[in-house]
Interface confidence: low
């Protein structure tokens, strides 16, 4: 059991108050984290509370302002980037969001040597992406889908690509589907370690079908947003990778990197690029049927000025039980010999573990093992490998940081974080300086988050970077709900759950139950993290019990659980939520006439199917921005788990797993359907089709749309959304307003 550390004495209970919805909507109890912006082994930058950019030297203990808030304010900068030679800073302003990661902005270059903005050959606006070279102060940027290079900030730009066209050809930035479902970045260009070469992707969306939706705005006629968006089975983007010598960019021009023959024989994806040295690069490719991935190590041929990818340097990763990798195929972390690498993939027992690959994948040496999973490799130095896993005390929803000494034989393993602040901190991430001389640990819970600085050699804590004292003080008179993380064993499946209980929880009483579900493949909802959010309020003030359950298809508990949903989305995820609810009822404190379920996105899909399961368990439920048919969602994501919607592949299950097919079953539940009309991700089409099917079946339901809002329903819509959902649930549970 994980209980929130108690901060309450009975004598003080009369001064305590419950959380309010206003607390949540105002972000009153939000926490801060501190991630150093490392610029060397012992120095980092940080933006102070008053917006100065301050350089800290850990070893001398000194700090000084490199850029004043006055300079930042002069161009309304909201972000900055220091050139590696420390001569220039770019200042970012006029931030304009596009999709999940992408945005455009205006960039100004500030010369630290003379304290002036660089004049002459200013950057065009708005820029889609801009970055410094890893050494010196070269600039690469993307403007109007083309890539430009500046040897120095004041120099005229050198245009690298010329074929960029809105919604057609993307150079150095991903198109919609690659941004959201493959790269998870706003950029698609990569500098070599010393800035000699620049690699970039070109995405050709010419043949991709376009999703079009109205953006109502304030004008007489709505605008139409057009996005090349490949849905399941549709034509996909065509990707090519090029590398250009940035020292002599016009000398040979961009050189295309060849695609491995076994990949190029049918539709494929590029999944990531990792530079090894200035003259060695590693590319990862994936077949459209995403169970085969190829890692290809390519070398620069000086004589031909080309990139050579010998077959002997191709490493194949294949899954026979599901798709390749977890959510994404993992990326390699190269060792100092610049050819061998460490990588996380499934071991023979079906658990994701770190392997060391020196020549072939078949001869890989397994570095970690057990019935738990290695989750991320943070850093490999000459003598240590730092990684995170959920091994400690067998709680899948924890993250601890480990160090393996690879310099000694046999390698020894040490948990760096397990016993640091055991009650408060069970879910960590880390950020390392150059050569791992120092690192920051960021603890997300279950207690109040705390960020600390550590010595990379001894692991000693040097100082606290952020401990959220103000938050701790603000929570002293708040009746927070209790949280417990436990597991259910059902038919050889382990279902981990988190239960959020009202502050004065009494097992002899009956409480309404709200299930919060996401449930998407390779997701995890049951995590030992701190949060004061809407469901905290529902437990604290409205006396509900809230439960989150990780069923089949969820991550970090082995391939058997993860790949159980392969080619069968919408079946086991729903079954496992229902199974858990039945178990919760057996616990004796749930009012079985007042059970609800809600979810967003994939969770909206699962909650809809659970409501339409015909079990009679749920009185009501909410689906926010749900997927309603996998034929409506993006190819890269959907086909990874479902295959293709063709007769000879998996069309039958595509058809059987829609929400619309179960319209009749909504007759006996109260259903609230919510969607933003400008959702670029899960298109409004999904909810429109649910609504149409319910109307055609003459089933009553409630609905709310948010005009011109995307998948995140942000801003004032957030307040309206949670207020609306609160009213709906209170009405469903017969709670007074």
């Amino acid at each position: 059991i994980v209980l929130r550390p108690s901060r309450v004495h009975n004598s003080e209970e009369n001064t305590m108050r419950a959380l309010t919805l206003k607390d949540i909507l105002n972000g009153t109890f939000s926490y801060k984290t501190f991630f150093p912006n490392w610029i060397s082994g012992q120095e980092y930058l940080h933006q102070s509370a008053d917006n100065n950019i301050v350089l800290y030297n850990i070893e001398t203990g000194q700090s000084y302002t490199i850029l004043s808030n006055r300079t930042m304010k002069s161009v309304n900068a909201s972000n900055y980037g220091l050139s590696p030679d420390r001569q220039f800073v770019y200042l970012e302003s006029d931030y304009s969001k596009l999709w999940r990661y992408s945005y455009t902005a205006t960039y100004y270059i500030y010369d630290l040597s003379n304290g002036e903005f660089v004049r002459g050959n200013e950057l065009p606006r708005p820029i889609q992406y801009l970055c410094w070279s890893p050494v010196g102060s070269k600039l690469a940027y993307v403007y109007q889908n083309n890539i430009y290079l500046k040897q120095r900030p004041g120099d005229p730009p050198f245009q690298i690509t010329f074929n960029g066209r809105e919604n057609k050809i993307f150079n150095g930035i991903p198109d919609w589907v690659y941004e959201e479902e493959m790269l998870a970045t706003k950029y698609a260009l990569w500098w070599s370690p010393n800035g000699k070469f620049l690699a970039y992707a070109e995405f050709n969306d010419t043949d991709i079908p376009v999703i079009a939706y109205s953006y109502y705005g304030d004008e007489q006629y709505p605008r139409t947003i057009n996005i090349p968006y490949p849905k399941a089975g549709a034509k996909n983007p065509v990707v090519r990778i090029f590398i250009i010598d940035t020292t002599y960019p016009a000398y040979v021009g961009p050189q295309e990197v060849p695609v491995p023959a076994m990949i190029a024989s049918s539709d494929y994806y590029f999944s990531w690029l990792t530079w090894v040295t200035d003259e060695r690069v590693c590319l990862q490719w994936l077949k459209r049927v995403q169970n085969v991935s190829v890692l290809s190590i390519c070398d620069f041929r000086e004589d031909w000025q080309t990139w050579d990818c010998p077959k002997t340097q191709e490493h194949i990763e294949e899954s026979r039980t599901g798709w390749a990798g977890g959510f994404f195929v993992s990326t390699p972390v190269f060792s100092y010999d610049a050819i061998s690498y460490y990588k996380i993939f499934s071991d023979k027992d079906g658990y994701k573990h770190i392997h060391y690959i020196k020549d072939t994948v078949e001869n890989a040496i397994q570095i970690t093992s057990g019935k738990w999973e290695a989750i991320n490799i943070f850093r490999v130095t000459q003598d240590s490998l730092f990684y995170s896993s959920n091994e400690f005390e067998e709680y899948p929803g924890r993250r601890n940081i480990y160090r393996i000494s690879i310099g000694s034989y046999p390698p020894s393993k040490k948990c760096v974080t397990c016993h640091l602040r055991k009650e408060r901190c069970q879910y960590y991430t880390a950020s390392f300086s150059d050569y791992a001389k120092y690192y920051a640990l960021v603890c997300y819970g279950p207690g109040i988050p705390i960020s600390t600085l550590h010595d990379g050699r001894t692991d000693q804590e040097i100082k606290i970077l952020e401990e959220n004292k103000e938050l701790e003080n603000a929570l002293k008179n708040i009746q927070l709900p209790k949280e417990e993380i436990k597991k259910l064993e059902v038919d050889e499946i382990t279902l981990w759950y988190k239960m959020i209980l009202p502050p004065q929880f009494d097992r002899s009483k009956k409480y309404p139950l709200l299930i919060q579900v996401y449930g998407g493949p390779c997701s995890q909802s049951v995590r030992s993290v701190f949060a004061v959010n809407w469901i905290s309020y529902l437990a604290s003030k409205e006396g509900m019990v809230i439960a989150l359950v990780d069923g089949r298809g969820t991550a970090f508990q082995g391939d058997k659980l993860l790949y159980a949903v392969y080619r069968k989305l919408g079946v086991y995820e729903v079954e496992d939520q229902i199974t858990a609810v039945r178990k919760f009822i057996e616990m004796g404190f749930i009012d079985e006439k007042r059970i609800a379920i809600w979810g967003w996105s994939y969770g909206g899909y699962v909650s809809s199917l659970a409501l339409a399961s015909g079990t009679g368990l749920f009185k009501c439920g909410i689906a926010v921005a749900p997927v309603s048919s996998w034929e409506y969602y993006a190819s890269v994501y959907t086909e990874r788990f479902m295959g293709l919607p063709t007769k000879d592949d998996n069309l039958e299950h595509y058809k059987n797993s829609t929400v619309m097919a179960r319209a009749e079953y909504f007759r006996n539940v109260d259903y609230l359907l919510i969607h933003g009309t400008a959702d670029d991700n899960v298109h409004f089409q999904n909810s429109a089709q649910i609504a149409k099917a319910l109307v055609n079946a003459q089933v009553d339901f409630q609905a709310m749309w948010y005009s011109d809002q995307n998948h995140g329903l942000s801003g004032l819509s957030t307040n309206h959304l949670y207020t609306h959902m609160t009213h709906f649930l209170k009405q469903c549970f017969s709670l007074s307003d």
């Epitope: 074929n163 040979v252 021009g253 080309t306």
Partner: antibody, heavy 129, light 107 residues
Framework: HVQLQESGPGLVKPSETLSLTCTVS??????????WGWIRQTPGKGLEWIGS???????NYNPSLKSRVTISVDTSKNQFSLKLSSVTAADTAVYYC?????????????????????WGQGTMVTVSS | ETTLTQSPGTLSLSPGERATLSCRAS???????LAWYQQKPGQAPRLLMY???NRAAGVPDRFSGSGSGTDFTLTISRLEPEDFAVYYC????????FGQGTKVEIK
């Protein structure tokens, strides 16, 4: 490293066709990143670009010579060739083949220039009866 | 067609001196698509600069290029004995054209 070598007759009679071949060694002619050109140099007119070809076969000629010029490519032999018809004494010159490094993005819709970064040593062609 | 005019026709200087060569275009050179070449007697031209200001591989940093639009300059900061040659500019809008050349000779 890449080297270019011109070959062909040094003497051509007026009104006949001048034929030269350029052999590329040390690198492939079938690269996205290069085009291949012919330039000539006369004492009177200095350096004059004749035309260029891309390995796909698309060509770009100097308008002043276009009616008389044909440039072709043989990727299997790693060669490209120049034919200049109806020659006169004014066509007497040193003929160079050269590699152009592109900065136009692929696929090429037309050959656009960069600079000629590698040249052959040149071959003298005299037009005389 | 863009005509390139180089000046002066001949430049007589001593080793160690600075050389400034000019190239003027009859119309704007697209995207500064301008190159400079060096040619010695009996040899093919050698690429020095491209894109008006970028040095080609292996070219010493005493050579620098500048300019945009219609006026371009090649500067040799300190003449070495091997720098005495004829220098040509070239633009690569179609058709590609060359300047008539500037001869840098030993004074």
């Amino acid at each position: 490293h890449v080297q270019l070598q011109e070959s062909g007759p040094g003497l051509v009679k007026p009104s006949e066709t001048l034929s030269l071949t350029c052999t590329v060694s040390g690198g492939s002619i079938s690269s996205n990143n290069y085009y291949w050109g012919w330039i000539r140099q006369t004492p009177g007119k200095g350096l004059e670009w004749i035309g260029s070809i891309y390995y796909s076969g698309s060509t770009n000629y100097n308008p002043s010579l276009k009616s008389r010029v044909t440039i072709s490519v043989d990727t299997s032999k790693n060669q490209f060739s120049l034919k200049l018809s109806s020659v006169t004494a004014a066509d007497t010159a040193v003929y160079y083949c050269a590699r152009g490094a592109r900065w136009q993005a692929r696929p090429a819709t037309r050959i656009d220039g960069v600079a000629f970064d590698i040249w052959g040593q040149g071959t003298m062609v005299t037009v005389s009866s | 067609e863009t005509t390139l005019t180089q000046s002066p026709g001949t430049l007589s200087l001593s080793p160690g001196e600075r050389a400034t060569l000019s190239c003027r275009a009859s119309q704007t050179v697209t995207r500064n698509y301008l190159a400079w070449y060096q040619q010695k007697p009996g040899q093919a031209p050698r690429l020095l600069m491209y894109g008006a200001s970028n040095r080609a591989a292996g070219v010493p940093d005493r050579f620098s290029g500048s300019g945009s639009g219609t006026d371009f300059t090649l500067t040799i900061s300190r003449l070495e004995p091997e720098d005495f040659a004829v220098y040509y500019c070239q633009q690569f809008g179609s058709p590609y054209t060359f300047g008539q050349g500037t001869k840098v000779e030993i004074k």
